[in-house]
Amino acid sequence: MNGRVDYLVTEEEINLTRGPSGLGFNIVGGTDQQYVSNDSGIYVSRIKENGAAALDGRLQEGDKILSVNGQDLKNLLHQDAVDLFRNAGYAVSLRVQHRLQVQNGPIGHRGEGDPSG
C-alpha cells in the first residue's frame, strides 16, 4: 500500500516593510493564470534572496496570499493582483495560507518520508 499525502493548512498575518527593491518575492495565479487547478488564488512562486520577504523569514514559496492590507485577492486578474502589491505602500500586511505536506503511511507502517527506517 502507498502512503497517503495530507496537508496541514495554517494561516498567518505577515507584516513586511518594503525594501530598496520592493517586497522581494514573485507571484503567480489569478483568474487568467491559474496556478492550481480550479483555484484562481495568488501564490508565492519565488522568494528573492536578501529581499524584504527573505529577511523576514516567514513567507515561503508555495504560500497562498489571501489578502494584502485587508484587501481580498479572490477573483483578481493576475495584473490586478500585481498592481495591488506594487501600490500597497511602505508597510504591507499579508494574510497568508501555508500548506505543509504531511506524509502518512498506512496504519502500522512508517511513511516513506520517515528518516528512522
Epitope: K48, A52, Q79
Partner: nanobody, 125 residues
C-alpha cells in the same frame, strides 16, 4: 530538467538586423517572466529586455529602446529578441533567462532570474 536554448546569433555588419530565439522546456512557460541579458568580453552581464507572462508588458534597457523588441509565444514556449540597427557596441554573448511568476522586486538584475541558457554570440562589425 529545465532547459533554455538560444539560437540566431551570428556575425553581421553595423545597421543590420538579427532575430534571437530562446526555446524553453521543463517549465510551465506561461507562468514565467522571461528576459534577455548580454555580456561583452571583460564586462558584467547586463539587462537587455524583459517580458511578462502574457506578453502584455515589456521593459527595455535605455541602450536598446526603439531598436530591440522582445516577444513571446506561449503556445510554442519561445521568447524572441528582434534586434534592428545593430551597432558594434551591441557585440556580446546574449543570454535568455527565466523566473517563475511576476516579480514584486525588480526584473533587471541577473540575480532575479533562476534559469539561464548557454548564450549565443552576436558580433557586429
Amino acid at each position: 530538467e529545465v532547459q533554455l536554448v538560444e539560437s540566431g546569433g551570428g556575425l553581421v555588419q553595423a545597421g543590420d538586423s538579427l532575430r534571437l530565439s530562446c526555446a524553453a522546456s521543463g517549465i510551465t512557460f506561461r507562468w514565467y517572466t522571461m528576459a534577455w541579458f548580454r555580456q561583452a568580453p571583460g564586462k558584467e552581464r547586463d539587462f537587455v529586455a524583459t517580458i511578462n507572462w502574457s506578453g502584455s508588458d515589456t521593459n527595455y534597457a535605455d541602450s536598446v529602446k526603439g531598436r530591440f523588441t522582445i516577444s513571446r509565444d506561449n503556445a510554442k514556449n519561445t521568447v524572441t529578441l528582434q534586434m534592428n540597427s545593430l551597432q558594434p557596441e551591441d557585440t556580446a554573448v546574449y543570454y535568455c533567462a527565466g523566473v517563475p511568476g511576476t516579480s514584486l522586486s525588480g526584473e533587471t538584475d541577473p540575480r532575479d532570474y533562476d534559469y539561464w541558457g548557454q548564450g549565443t554570440q552576436v558580433t557586429v562589425s
